[in-house]
Each structure stands twice: as C-alpha cells, then as structure tokens.
Interface confidence: low
C-alpha cells in the first residue's frame, strides 16, 4: 500500500511530515523525494523532539494502532559493504541527504556487526507505554525491506523538507478560516511556521456564504532572510469584535477606535513592520540578520551591525551568511576527503581503515583476521576486499556468498555414484552394500559376499547385541534420517542400483560397512544420508559415530 495519513510540524527552517503505510525504505525515500525532501534526519535531541511531535500528530489521527511496536523509517542507512564502526555515534550509518557524522544517537540496542547487506534505521515506538515527551523514540536497525515485503512492523515514515525561511502564520482579526498549501503538497489550517513559497487561502466570515470574503497570499522572501505574506493589516476584521477577537490579529498591542476600527501597535523598543500586524525589535541584531552561524556584532551607537563567522567559515558575497571553507581542495587525505562544516575529515574506501604513516593515511582491513572473518570456511584477504572459499565437497551459498553448503553427491548431476547404497556426509559421501554383498576395493561397486544375509563381517560391535529387527529397504528408496537411542543420527541410505531382484523385499539388519582401502579397519555408522525432504541443516559426523568414510584422495567415487 502507499502512504496514507500525514501530519505536519514546521519549525526553524524545516518541516517534518509523518505518513502511515507499509513501504520499504527505498519507497519511503522516493515518496519524500517526489515532494522535494528526504527521509528525516534526527541529528540532535531537538530534532528528535520535532520528529516525535509529528509522529504524535499522526498517532492522534490514527486513533489507536494495533501493533505493540510501531516503526517509522528515517533517513539513516548503511550501504552494503560498509562495516559497522562502533566508535562512531552513528555506527557507520549515514544520513540519506548527506552531511557530516552527527553526535546525537538513540540506539535501541547494541548493533551486530555485518557488512554484507544494506541496513536501514527506523524509529521504534512502544505503544504499550504512554508516549511521553521525555521518552524519545529509539533507533532500530534492520533490513531495508523491498516492495514485496516492506519490513516487519514498519508502520510508516517521516520526511523532512528544508526551506530558506518561514513566514509567521497569518493572524485573523475576526472570524475566518486559513488554509495553507505547502510546497510539499500538504494542506493544513494550523502551522506554527509556514514555509517559504506556501500559499494561504483566507476565507473570512462565520460560515454565512453571503458575508464570506476570500484572500490569497504567498509566503515570499521580501529581503534577504525576511519572509512575509505581503498582506497589510489584520485580516477578517469586524467592527462587531474590534480588538476582542484574537487581539485583533495583532502581534503585540491592539488599539480600538470609537467606530469599531482598530490599529495594531508595538511595545517600547519594538517597531511595527510593513504588514501592520507584526512587531520587531529596534535593535538591528534582534531580527537575526546574520545567517549560517554568523554572529551579529552591533556597530557604534547601536545603529548598524556586521556579521562575524566562526573558525573554518567565511562570509559570502551578501556579507550576512557564513559559508564553509573547503579544506579538501588542498587534498589533505590519502583516499577520501569529506568537507564538513567548519572543518574536514579523512575517510577510507570500503575495505580500508584509518592507519599507516602520515595524517589521513589508510590501510587495508584484514577481513579474514581471527575472530573477524565473515566466511564460514575459507577466507582470503585482498587489497580493499576479501573473498570466501569452501573446502572440497562444499559450494558457496547464501545471498552474500559467505556460507558453505554441502554438495549432495548422492543426487549429483551425473546420477548416483555408487552401485548400490549411497550415503551423503558433510563434505563427502560413501558407498555401501545391501546385506549379502560387500563393497569392492574401489569403494563403489558391490560384490556377492558369503551366502549369509547378515551384516558384512567385520570387528564385533556393541550395537550388534540384540538388534535383529531388520528394516525393509525397497528399491531406490530414500528416507529421512532417524535418531538412535543416544540421539546419534541413524542414516537410512539412498538405494541406487541394488543387484538383487527388484521384486524381492530386502531385509537388512543394522548396517555395518567396511571402510574402503583408503582407511582400513575404520568402522563407523552412517551419520547422515541423503533425504529428498531433508529437514534442517545437515550435521557433521561426530567423532564417536561409526560411518565408513571416503578419503579425499582423488580415487573413483571419492572427493
């Protein structure tokens, strides 16, 4: 489903919208992007509070979500191949819209190391507890979902839209209704700040159609960093109410005339702006003319001002805004240089880590180092990367190619490798024979043994005692492994080409097989056989199990 309900909070120079709907992180980002935003950042406690407020609005509208845990995507992600960095607050994750590593974090729990697949972050709301302001949503990390499966428990997402500035909400001096339409296609009648380029429709009157007047305004940039509606005087004024309705729509003082008309005024130290409603301080610095972290410095006699920038920044051509000095132009790093506000930092490519001689140097990460290897079996470190390999009898498996899966030789593409019984084992296989037949020295064929239909001769074994109930093995049968009395796997073999007549049932006492010539005199019980519907992963044979094993020495029928 798409994104449904939405809520809006605008504060500072950004608006946050919350949407409900089960989408993958990519679909959610795309939705935000279509309207000119990104999945929201949560770079500080203050921003976390803004995001929580917009989620609060959404939850109010949704009335009561039934999930105990609700998750909402935010714009924090880690690309495939980028490993966890426990030393950083963001743990190696980065914000979708770019920007520096930020100090604030609110992780739900310790993160597990994994570099294999892309990971995304959502805000976790525990709806079994009351959602209180002092309890900010935790960050939960997990798979990013896909269009078919957006991610378990994902209820929605939060977008962020940034603007040059905001207009104050329009103040009505009499009955009426304001409807704001924002550049990100949201309509609202109550915004605490209205983003630049928003439209406002004002319908004056108390719902009586004859009396209704309509006004249309646009939030424009009147001067650098000064945003207003271009309206003049309070809206929807009515002699019937004078200053009694919403203080006449005035920012500070409202002065009534005898005829029901009124004017807005300002307190000492403030002046009335061109909209004839809003008051601003007479101190030139009080309107915060300096932007981008610049400090406003009053000139002599408090008449004018200059803007001053912090270290690592310089004033732009407007002399009002600070712009970052790009230290990366001097190439101070060995691999990657990231210019940050007021400074820079060196980064290493995926597969490298900071280290080595010199400032900003990088060295290869040994992914195969002890305790660090992502591979199930063999691991080869390469410059900036690594690759996994498997021992003979196994092939690489898993979506990331780090796992090893046993090759089942008993159902190999070339057909059965054994003349009679075939036993698949972890990383290998071996052949066996039906009662009355013995395994030939080549470990593959069966030759007629003594006339007795008992087990092939060999060293006596504890397990022979009292085990005379045979199991019927029909031609070419496969069966699931059964567990012996001690919990050891008892293998029922795959039967390939029994040399006995096919219509005669074959009764077998518990199987004992002689090991082929590669390992004379080793007696083992088959640990795992091939099963067409094997349940669960196959286990390697335990040291005390008794299976006739093949050597990996290149002989026929062996690996």
């Amino acid at each position: 489903t798409g994104a449904d309900t939405e809520a809006v909070v605008c504060v500072g120079t950004a608006c946050y919208t919350a949407h409900s709907g089960k989408l993958s992180a990519a679909e959610a980002q795309n939705h935000c992007n279509q309207n000119g935003g990104n999945l929201a950042t949560v770079k500080s406690k203050e921003e976390a509070q803004h995001v929580q407020r917009v989620l609060a609005q959404l939850l109010r509208r949704e009335a009561a979500l039934t999930a105990r845990m609700s998750k909402f995507w935010i714009g924090l992600q880690r690309e495939k191949g980028k490993c966890l960095d426990p030393s950083l607050p963001l743990k190696g994750f980065s914000w979708v819209g770019g920007g520096e590593d930020t100090p604030y974090s609110n992780w739900h729990k310790e993160l597990r190391n994994s570099c294999i697949s892309k990971r995304c972050v959502s805000l976790l709301l525990d709806l079994s507890q009351p959602l209180l302001p002092s309890r900010l949503p935790k960050w939960s990390e997990g798979p990013c979902g896909s269009p078919g499966s957006p991610g378990s428990n994902i209820e929605g997402f939060v977008c962020k839209f940034s603007f040059k500035g905001m207009c104050r909400p329009l103040a009505l001096g009499g009955p009426g209704q304001v409807t704001y339409t924002t550049p990100f296609q949201t309509t609202s009648s109550s915004l605490e700040a209205v983003p630049f380029a928003s439209a406002a429709n004002v319908a004056c009157g108390e719902g009586d159609k004859d009396e209704t007047q309509s006004h249309y305004f646009l939030c424009k940039e009147k001067a650098p960093d000064v945003f207003d509606w271009g309206s003049s005087g309070p809206l929807c004024v009515s002699p019937k109410y004078g200053c009694n309705f919403n203080n006449g729509g005035c920012h500070q003082d409202c002065f009534e005339g005898g005829d029901g008309s009124f004017l807005c005024g300002c307190r000492p130290g403030f002046r009335l702006l061109d909209d004839l409603v809003t008051c601003a301080s007479r101190n030139p610095c009080s309107s915060s003319p300096c932007r981008g972290g610049a400090t406003c410095v009053l000139g002599p006699h408090g008449k004018n001002y200059t803007c001053r920038c912090p270290q690592g920044y310089q004033l732009d051509s407007s002399q009002l805004d600070c712009v970052d000095v790009d230290e990366c132009q001097d190439s101070p790093c060995a691999q990657e240089c990231v210019n940050t506000p007021g400074g820079f930092r060196c980064e290493c490519w995926v597969g490298y880590e900071p280290g080595g001689p010199g400032e900003g140097a990088c060295q290869d990460v040994d992914e195969c180092a002890l305790g660090r290897s992502p591979c199930a079996q063999g691991c080869t470190n390469t410059d900036g990367s690594f690759h996994c390999s498997c021992e003979e009898g196994y092939v690489l498996a898993g979506e990331d190619g780090t796992q090893c899966q046993d090759v089942d030789e008993c159902v190999g593409p070339g057909g059965p490798l054994c003349d009679s019984l075939c036993f698949n084992t972890q990383g290998s296989f071996h052949c066996g024979c039906l009662p009355g037949w013995v395994l030939a020295p080549n470990g593959v064929s069966c030759t007629m043994g003594p006339v007795s239909l008992g087990p092939p001769s060999g060293p006596p074994d504890e397990e022979d005692k009292g085990e005379k109930e045979g199991s019927t093995v029909p031609r070419a049968a496969t069966a699931s492994p059964t567990r012996g009395p001690e919990g050891t796997p008892k293998a029922t073999p795959t039967t390939s080409r029994p040399s006995l007549s096919s219509d005669a049932p074959i009764t077998s006492a518990p199987l004992k097989m002689l090991a082929p010539s590669g390992s004379p005199g080793v007696w083992r019980e088959p640990s795992i056989h091939h099963a067409t519907a094997a349940s669960g992963p196959q286990e390697p044979a335990g040291g005390d199990s008794s299976v006739a094993t093949q050597n990996n020495d290149g002989t026929d029928g062996q690996k």
Partner: antibody
C-alpha cells in the same frame, strides 16, 4: 454527551481485593486512554495508572505495581481497576478519567468517583 | 518523580478580586515548546474538572476569567475576578513524565 459512569461504593476487609468499573459513552472508546486517580479523605490526587482500551496495554504508577490490574471490555466500553491486598490506607475515592491518545495527556472528562472503604 | 509544590495552601479573596495560585515543579515540565502543565478545579463532593491545559490553554466552556501562565518550572493560575462559584480546591498536574503527579492543592475561599 461524553460520560464516564462508575460502579457503586464498596466496603472491604484488609487483605481483600476490590474491582471498580467505569463505563464510557458518547465518544469512541478506543481513541482515548483511560486513567485511574485516587483521592484519600481530605488529601490530594494520586495517579494510579492508565489503560489503552484499543489494545489493552497498561501502564502503572510504580507505587501500585503488582497490586493494581487494569482491564477493559471493548464490547461494553467498560474499563476495570482491581486493587489487591487492601489496607486502611487504600480507603479513598477512586476516579476514572480519560485522556487524549498522545502528547499532553490531560484528563478532560472524569467519572463521579467510587468510594472504597477498607475496614476490619 | 517530579514533585509539584503549590502555594499558598489556602487563599481568601473578596468577590470580584484577583486570585493567584502558584505551582512549582521540581524539574522542567517543558517539551518541544510546550509546557505539560494542567490545572483542575475540584468542588466538594465532585470530581476534578479540567480548567487549563498546556499551561495557558483554556478548556472549552471554562469562563475566561481563568487564565494560566508560566513555563519550565514555575506556573501561575489566575482568577481575574473571583465569583462565588469559584470556591474550590485547585490542583496543578504535570504530564511530562511518569508518574503523572499533582500538586497538593490550593483551597480558594471568599473573604
């Protein structure tokens, strides 16, 4: 109109339990949390906990944890508060009150109260 | 727990005069620009009634002689012109943190 109607007065012995009910009407029962607040004779107000009638989630004041149980019956739009191991200190008027789902959870509608007297 | 302290404990004011009740929280009850502080009125034998929420917002149906102000830890409830029906106990309450806590109450009487 919006109303919360509580069950009648109760007299209990120390060590016993009491179960007070609060029936809601005039609004969507599942869209508001329901709280329980008590007031001992001549004393102030004390918040005991709350229940989300939608999913039956509860959240209790630690002071009452283990002794208080809040439940709800969606079909009859009724919430219940059971307090166990009563002592004379639990003699009070018990109020149910509703609050918005999230944010400033002020109590905009209150029940008339149920007087519980614990006496041997 | 956040402790809410009301002052005075009781207040006697002449009809038509201003009554002012203070409420102090042991820590800030502000969050994201809002104060999570509410005022209730309780008359004898009745449940409390919401007067003001979020420090200064008048609940619908409450006379506008009641007003609230303050932020952070210090809050005030003002009755601009006391009427006979305003005789009651007034409680402040914070909803910023668990457990939700109330002040001890201020009894308003007519002088």
């Amino acid at each position: 109109q919006v109303q919360l109607v509580q069950s009648g007065a109760e007299v209990k012995k120390p060590g016993a339990s009491v179960k007070v009910s609060c029936k809601a009407s005039g609004y969507t029962f599942t869209s508001y949390w329901m709280h329980w607040v008590r007031q001992a004779p001549g004393q102030g107000l004390e918040w005991m906990g709350e229940i989300d009638p939608s999913a039956s989630y509860t959240y209790y004041n630690q002071k009452f944890k283990g002794r208080v149980t809040m439940t709800r019956d969606k079909s009859s739009s009724t919430v219940y508060m059971e307090l166990s191991s009563l002592t004379s200190e639990d003699s009070a008027v018990y109020y149910c009150a509703r609050s918005v789902y999230y944010g400033n959870k002020y109590f905009d509608v209150w029940g008339a109260g149920t007087t519980v007297t614990v006496s041997s | 727990d956040i402790v809410m302290t009301q002052s005075p404990d009781s207040l006697a004011v002449s009809l038509g005069e201003r009554a002012t009740i203070n409420c102090k929280a042991s820590q800030s009850v502000d969050y994201a620009g809002d104060s999570y502080l509410n005022w209730y009125q309780q008359k004898p034998g009745q449940p409390p009634k919401l007067l003001i929420y979020a420090a200064s917002n008048l609940e619908s149906g409450v006379p506008d002689r009641f007003s609230g102000s303050g932020s952070g830890t210090d809050f005030t409830l003002t009755i601009s012109s006391l009427q006979a029906e305003d005789v009651a106990v007034y409680y402040c309450q914070q909803t910023n943190e668990d457990p939700r806590t109330f002040g001890g109450g201020t009894k308003v009487e007519i002088k």
